[in-house]
Structures are given as C-alpha cells and as structure tokens.
C-alpha cells in the first residue's frame, strides 16, 4: 500500500502516524497548491488544523483582504492560515471549529461549534456555524446567522461605520458584533476598556482584550 504523501488537513496527518504537534505542509483540495499550517496533535485527541493564533502581539493583524485570503504570519507563532484554503477545505467535508481563549488572570475557556464552514470569496467568506457548546459563553460570540468577512480595504459589515477600520483586524463583523479575535493586541494592565481589542463578549464582556486565542478545525467524523 502506497504511503500518503499529500495531506488535506492535520487530521489526515495524524491518522498517517505523524502525531507530534508542529508545522506541516497541507495541500489545497483538488490542487497541488501547498500551504504551511500548525497542527495541534495534543488537544482533545489531536488532528487539529490551527487557522488562527494570537499570543503576544508580534504580528500585525490589521491586514488587507488579499492577505487574509492568502494567510500571513508564522505558523509557529501568531498567524492567520488563509480564508481561501479554509473555505475550500470546509466546503469539502463537515468540520468542527474549536476556539480556545486565555485571559490575563490565568483563566481558559473554549467554544466548540459542531459544524463550521466558510462560503467562497464570491460570498465574502461568510461564516456558517451551528451547535455551540463550551465554557466561553452559552451564546455565540460570533453573530448568528453568520456575517461576511470584512477587512480594512473591504467593508462588508452592517454598520454605518467601517468595523474593520474602527475595531482593527479582519473578522466576520456584523454591526460590529460580539467578537473580534483579530483585534488590536493589548498587553496586561492595558487590556481593559478597549473597544478595538481581542474580544469575546459572552466570556469576558465589553472592553476586555484577551491574552491568547486559537481557532482550530477538524473533520466532524475524526
């Protein structure tokens, strides 16, 4: 039996026997195009493809539509995997989304959505989510039904303001909505009373900017 040499996601890598967390090369569905991603092989059984990570403010997340489409940052640190890859991947099979959050007081929480996918670029990478569970709030901090993605140069929100310009970062802004994990990074003791910080309203409320965030996806049938 031939060994699999290309992998669609981190779950396939895990199942191939590579079970150490780290950077791996993934291949776009139905394509030879490659992308580097961080695979978390430890959390909740492993096999998670990390699509976003914040931890120290070392990477600027106030980026263009093109940059959010293609991805930016370093998979070893802060990064955004890329809307196009995630859209294509989650359009092929059913995926779950896990969001891990850390505050500045040493607390951790998570939100798990049992079905997650991004529409294509023609639909502004609109987010679709169902089935919320977890400890980071009983109500979804990503507006339901899902919103279109907006960046500083592509305003697709429902506000008479420009949410991405105002709140910083690309996100699925509503008007502007209860979350923004791509907001301005604020260090400890400067992280309160900030409307443009890293926000997850139904866990920490208004104005609290989080210490660290990770968004990761895995096939629902893993």
């Amino acid at each position: 039996k031939e060994e699999q040499t290309t992998f669609r996601d981190c779950a396939e890598i895990f199942k191939s026997g590579l079970t150490t967390s780290g950077i791996y090369t993934l291949t776009f569905p139905n394509s030879t195009e490659e992308i580097k991603a961080y695979c978390d092989m430890d959390v909740g059984g492993g096999g998670w493809t990390v699509i976003q990570h914040r931890e120290d403010g070392s990477v600027d997340f106030q980026r263009t539509w093109k940059e959010y489409k293609e991805g930016f940052g370093s998979p070893l640190g802060e990064y955004w995997l890329g809307n196009e890859f995630v859209s294509q991947l989650t359009g092929q099979h059913r995926y779950v989304l896990k969001i891990q959050l850390k505050d500045w007081e040493g607390n951790e929480a998570h939100s798990l959505y049992d079905h997650f996918y991004l529409a294509g670029e023609e639909s502004n990478y609109r987010i679709h989510l169902t089935g919320l569970t977890g400890t980071a709030g009983k109500i979804s901090s990503i507006s339901q039904p899902g919103s279109d993605f907006s960046t500083k140069d592509s305003d697709n929100d429902k506000c008479i303001c420009k949410c991405s310009q105002m709140l910083s970062g690309g996100w699925w802004f509503d008007a502007c909505g209860p979350s923004n994990l791509n907001g301005q990074y604020y260090p400890q003791k400067q992280n309160t009373n900030k409307f443009n910080g890293i926000k997850w309203y139904y866990w920490k409320g208004s104005g609290y900017s989080l210490k660290a965030t990770t968004m990761m996806i895995r096939p629902a049938d893993f």
Epitope: C159, M166, A175, C176, G177, P178, F195, N196, S206
Partner: antibody, heavy 123, light 112 residues
Amino acid sequence: EVQLVESGGGVVQPGRSLRLSCAASGFTFSSYGMHWVRQAPGKGLEWVSAISGSGGSTYYADSVKGRFTISRDNAKNSLYLQMNSLRAEDTAVYYCARDLLDYDILTGPYAYWGQGTLVTVSS
Amino acid sequence: DIVMTQSPLSLPVTPGEPASISCRSSQSLLHSNGYNYLDWYLQKPGQSPQLLIYLGSNRASGVPDRFSGSGSGTDFTLKISRVEAEDVGVYYCMQALQTPPTFGGGTKVEIK
C-alpha cells in the same frame, strides 16, 4: 431600516411627572446602549442619560440626577425616561439615540436619532 | 466635565467654496487605544441631528466625501471641501471620552 420613535411629551406643570417612551425597530435592541439627549428651544444639544444594552448600567447628567430614571424593556424593544419633579429648565425636545457600536462601552457616537418629543414645563 | 468650544458661531458660505469649523476641548480626547473620542453631527433645519464623523476622522456611511474630520488631542477641525446648499444647518462636535458626553455650542452654516 433602523427606526426610533419617541412619544409621551406634552405640557406639564413644574413639580409634576412625565414618562417618555422610545420604540425601536430594525436592529437587535438588546445589543445596544441607548441614550436620551435634549435640546431646549433655540439652544444646543445636552446629553441627559444612558443605559447599557442589558439595562444593568445607567448614567445621568448632574442636572437630572435623582429626578430622572432611564430604563428599558428589551422584550418590547422600548426605552423609557421617567421624569419627576420637573422644572422649567427641563423644557426641551427629547431625543432618544442609539450607540454606534453594539456590545460595547462607548458613550457614543450616536448613529441613529429619533424625531424627538417636546416636553414643556410651565405653570 | 469636559468643555467643548466651537468656532465660529456662525459661518456664511458660498456654494462650491470650502468651509472649516473648529472645535477645542478642555482636555485631551486621545484614548489609550489611539483614537480621539470626538464626533461631529449636523442638524439640518427642522430635523434631528445626524452623525457625520466619528472618532475624529471616520466618515459615517452615506456621508459625502466632501466632509472630513481631522485633529488630535484638544484641537479638531471639520472641513467641507465644496459646500452644497443641502449642507446648511447647525454643526456640533461632541466628546465621548468621558461621562457625561458634552457637545460644543454649535456652528450655524448658512448660504450667503
């Protein structure tokens, strides 16, 4: 389409009470901070009171503190201003206004305003 | 309370010409998040106020690009690059940094 419609204004004697209402539509009312701003005849704008989306936090101008009470009923998409011990200087058009940002802590800007309701305090 | 001072009180304008309104605050409106908490409103005759500019320099959706806001700290300016007849009314600046929010006294813009 966002709409704010005030009602309850009228002529009232000094020392009496009045309750203003603001009916909101076209947005998720419970997600937004709401405000009352007034304008005396021929004068400028004066902020009166504010309330958070949940109703848990309220704020007042010193000129009305202890006399006016702001409240909201999110089930009815309605904002209220209970005005007691009215004075001649409370005579104004009262506007209800909605915060620009939802789920937030700004005291403004005010993205949408109602048409206003006139309160006249006179003996 | 933060005191907002606008000038001029009245501004006669010629259509097609530029116009400028100044607003000064008694203390800095620059928040630690980098934004100036200063907004501009226009109240047209017989109407409610409408938001023009928020956070110092951001135009609200639907506001023509002939309107622009600038400034930082305590000194702010609203500029109209080419005044149109529909721009007449009273312009107010407002600080939203501290409670209570406070408005400037207003600048009445009228056609010459």
